[in-house]
């Protein structure tokens, strides 16, 4: 994995320490030849949780196009899910217009949907370079 990236089960992970909106975080990961993290298992969830700290952190899951979709095409319907109770709730009460269309890890690691413009930390994921 590149310097400052962590390896886990054949993937490399980079944990931000600053905040960006979901679209900006998504773009940042793409520019690093990566994508916002896609959580495929309870074990991967635990790994991410251990390294991210107890703060809201964007992941690569969004319903900005209608259905919930992982950014790498992983099937949401059959895949791992770890929503907080009562979530996702597409809350309109924030008063910003529209609901909540982007998913993030909460302080306890479970997921919540929120307004995509919130400046949260984020995690990038990339396949490990077999040559390294």
């Amino acid at each position: 994995c590149p310097v400052n990236w962590l390896e886990y089960e054949g993937s490399c992970y980079w944990f931000s320490r600053s905040g960006k909106s979901w679209p900006e975080a998504d773009k940042y990961c793409q520019l690093e030849s990566a994508h916002l993290v896609v959580v495929n298992s309870r074990e991967e969830q635990k790994f991410i949780q251990h390294h991210m700290g107890p703060v809201n952190t964007w992941m690569g899951l969004t319903d900005q196009s209608g259905p919930w979709k992982w950014v790498d095409g992983t099937d949401y319907e059959t895949g791992f899910k770890n929503w907080r109770p009562e979530q996702p709730d597409d809350w309109y009460g924030h008063g910003l217009g529209g609901g909540e269309d982007c998913a993030h890890f909460t302080d306890d690691g479970r997921w919540n949907d929120d307004v995509c413009q919130r400046p949260y930390r984020w995690v990038c994921e990339a396949a490990r370079d077999p040559a390294t």
Partner: antibody, heavy 117, light 107 residues
Framework: EVQLVESGGGLVKPGGSLRLSCAAS????????MNWVRQAPGKGLEWVSS????????YYADSVKGRFTISRDNAKNSLYLQMNSLRAEDTAVYFC??????????WGQGTLVTVSS | DIQMTQSPSSLSASVGDRVTITCRAS??????LNWYQQKPGKAPKLLIY???SLQSGVPSRFSGSGSGTDFTLTISSLQPEDFATYYC?????????FGPGTKVDIK
């Protein structure tokens, strides 16, 4: 395949009650807000009610507030609309639809409710 | 509540024509504007969401634009299957509201 199928429509007298159902399949039902939209004969679309995935948030059009109740059973992948104190102006095709701020998709085929004496 | 208006209420056009339908909101809805197509006896079909995003499976001749209060649905080259009624809908805040519709029929 993502699919919604409504049922429960029919003929009812003014002041009567009816319960509509919408059976969902092909997606994780609890992850989505659901909606009821109606269309009176020869008229346009009217939003009726919405409910969030876990029923935490519920919204109604003023025209049905206090008379209609939206609910869902995520274990049964089903959405409901309990309609009480029905009026002639409630006569319409009732559609259920998935979604929220990014639009409603898909829609069911609709079920006709006729309120007449 | 946010009121939605559409113009024209109906229009006659020929196959191949460029068709434009406008939708206006009574207050700013940023980009939370969706367009639907409905054919007689059928359920509405989502065409465009958040003003300009083309719904999956919808032909590219359909496009949407606008923000704030003024929005446009354009059909670049009308096809026989496009004769239908078109509705705009705001999803900025509750209660959600639809426009009255625009019927597109054959000239």
């Amino acid at each position: 395949e993502v699919q919604l199928v409504e049922s429960g429509g029919g003929l009812v007298k003014p002041g009567g009650s009816l319960r509509l159902s919408c059976a969902a399949s092909g997606f994780t039902f609890s992850s989505y807000s659901m909606n009821w939209v109606r269309q009176a004969p020869g008229k346009g679309l009217e939003w009726v009610s919405s409910i969030s995935g876990s029923s935490s948030y519920i919204y109604y059009a003023d025209s049905v507030k206090g008379r209609f109740t939206i609910s869902r059973d995520n274990a049964k992948n089903s959405l409901y609309l309990q309609m009480n104190s029905l009026r002639a102006e409630d006569t319409a095709v009732y559609f259920c639809a998935r979604g929220g701020s990014r639009g409603f998709d898909p829609w069911g085929q609709g079920t006709l409710v006729t309120v007449s004496s | 509540d946010i009121q939605m208006t559409q113009s024209p209420s109906s229009l006659s056009a020929s196959v191949g024509d460029r068709v434009t339908i406008t939708c206006r909101a009574s207050q700013s809805i940023t980009s939370y504007l969706n367009w639907y197509q409905q054919k007689p006896g059928k359920a509405p079909k989502l065409l465009i969401y958040t003003a300009s995003s083309l719904q999956s499976g919808v032909p590219s001749r359909f496009s949407g634009s606008g923000s704030g209060t003024d929005f446009t649905l354009t059909i670049s080259s009308l096809q026989p299957e496009d004769f239908a009624t078109y509705y705009c809908q705001q999803s900025h805040s509750f209660p959600f509201t639809f426009g009255p519709g625009t019927k597109v029929d054959i000239k």
